[in-house]
């Protein structure tokens, strides 16, 4: 099939990084700058992806290949292939409307981007808080009171952060 | 409030030079992430991006308009500027700034523009 | 340069009714397309930005979907202020890029 198909169209025989030019009678042209084509038979080749201003360039063009935009320092993608660029915060905030903003008490954001989220409430797993939350990290829990009585290990694993919740302070 | 004004439009000679002046005001232009691009539209028509420059000083034109066109800004008057030379009739149009992104997401949309100065080119 | 191609480039329709405008691109580029609604004598207004992304103060009955080389705009209960002329704008590459605009009119 593949022989009779490039007998009858002689542009399938042009491979990725090249087009079927029919103003050279239909000879296989190498892509010009800034286009590529990712597959062979391809008629023309298409307009690299542009990475200007607040987009900086991730991967470069090839004639094979198109290339990937991320964002400048301070910022990060959203979005599919990084059609937007969002501000980053500071660990300890979240982005609003009008800018970063600390996070209320009782919340915590560990990283520069997403929402301040409830500290774990571990009274909710029977546990005592270990270490108290901050604007940058949640609470850490500890073994429940019944667990410190005499003879009992005091070196248990922190219980997993499920549901969130208040913790008392 | 985010504002652009754009002035010095007006009625120019074929052949001759236009410096139009868009002043911002409620951000600055040199804070990290902003655009501000100029964009025109003949009367009756559609929009043509003639060319942006961003926080950093990076500018970017339309190929049809480059030889032509440069586009500059003076941070501490928070003004953005559009040379023109060479005019021709088909240079007649509506000139706007608008400034690229939105509050916290950037990137190369227009969510605020100006009210536009209108640039006729006629003897 | 990435040609858009608005459809219809007028159309006529009621207060109530759901409208459609559709935007095609000469090649994919991706979900990098904006859509921006035009009065008369005045600036350009941004609707939507990255295909979908409804814009703060934009009411809801706006949306845009589509990615690749096609997009859509749907007004889904056309209001007197709706009459319009509609543009879309691709950030793919430069030069940026409008449509021809696609004008709606009361019927």
């Known amino acids: 099939f593949e022989r009779t198909r490039s007998l009858q169209d002689p542009c399938s025989n042009c491979p990725a990084g090249t087009f079927c030019d029919n103003n050279r009678n239909q000879i296989c042209s190498p892509c010009p700058p800034n286009s590529f084509s990712s597959a062979g038979g391809q008629r023309t080749c298409d307009i690299c992806r542009q990475c200007k201003g607040v987009f900086r360039t991730r991967k470069e063009c090839s004639s094979t290949s198109n290339a990937e935009c991320d964002c400048t320092p301070g910022f990060h993608c959203l979005g599919a292939g990084c059609s937007m660029c969002e501000q980053d915060c500071k660990q300890g905030q979240e982005l609003t409307k009008k800018g970063c903003k600390d996070c209320c008490f009782g919340t915590f954001n560990d990283q520069k981007r997403g929402i301040c989220r409830p500290w774990t409430n571990c009274s909710l797993d029977g546990k005592s808080v270990l270490v108290n939350g901050t604007k940058e990290r949640d609470v850490v829990c500890g073994p429940s009171p019944a667990d410190l009585s005499p003879g009992a290990s005091s070196v248990t694993p922190p219980a997993p952060a499920r549901e969130p919740g208040h913790s008392p302070q | 409030e985010v504002q652009l004004v754009e002035s010095g439009g007006g009625l120019v000679q074929p052949g001759g030079s236009l410096r139009l002046s868009c002043a911002a005001s409620?951000?600055?232009?040199?804070?990290?992430?902003?655009?501000v691009a100029w964009i025109r539209q003949a009367p009756g028509k559609g929009l043509e991006w003639i060319g942006d420059?961003?926080?950093?000083?990076?500018?970017y034109y339309n190929p049809s308009l480059k030889s032509r066109v440069t586009i500059s800004r003076d941070n501490s008057k928070n003004t953005l500027y559009l040379q023109l030379n060479s005019l021709r009739a088909e240079d007649t149009a509506v000139y706007y700034c608008?400034?690229?992104?939105?509050?916290?997401?950037?990137?190369?949309?227009?969510?605020?523009w100006g009210q536009g100065t209108l640039v006729t080119v006629s003897s | 340069d990435i040609q858009l191609t608005q459809s219809p480039s007028s159309l006529s329709a009621s207060v109530g009714d759901r409208v459609t405008i559709t935007c095609r691109a000469s090649?994919?580029?991706?979900?990098?397309l904006n859509w921006y609604q035009q009065k008369p004598g005045k600036a350009p207004k941004l609707l939507i930005y990255?295909?979908?992304t409804l814009q703060s103060g934009v009411p809801s009955r706006f949306s845009g979907s589509g990615s690749g080389t096609d997009f859509t705009l749907t007004i889904s209960s056309l209001q007197p202020e709706d009459f319009a002329t509609y543009y879309c704008?691709?950030?793919?590459?430069?030069?940026?890029?409008f449509g021809q605009g696609t004008k709606v009119e009361i019927k």
């Open positions: 608008a400034r690229g992104g939105s509050d916290t997401v950037v990137g190369d949309w227009f969510a605020y």
């Open positions: 409620g951000f600055s232009l040199s804070t990290s992430g902003v655009a």
């Open positions: 420059i961003y926080h950093s000083g990076n500018t």
């Open positions: 090649q994919s580029i991706s979900s990098y």
């Open positions: 990255a295909a979908s």
């Open positions: 704008q691709q950030y793919y590459s430069t030069p940026l890029t």
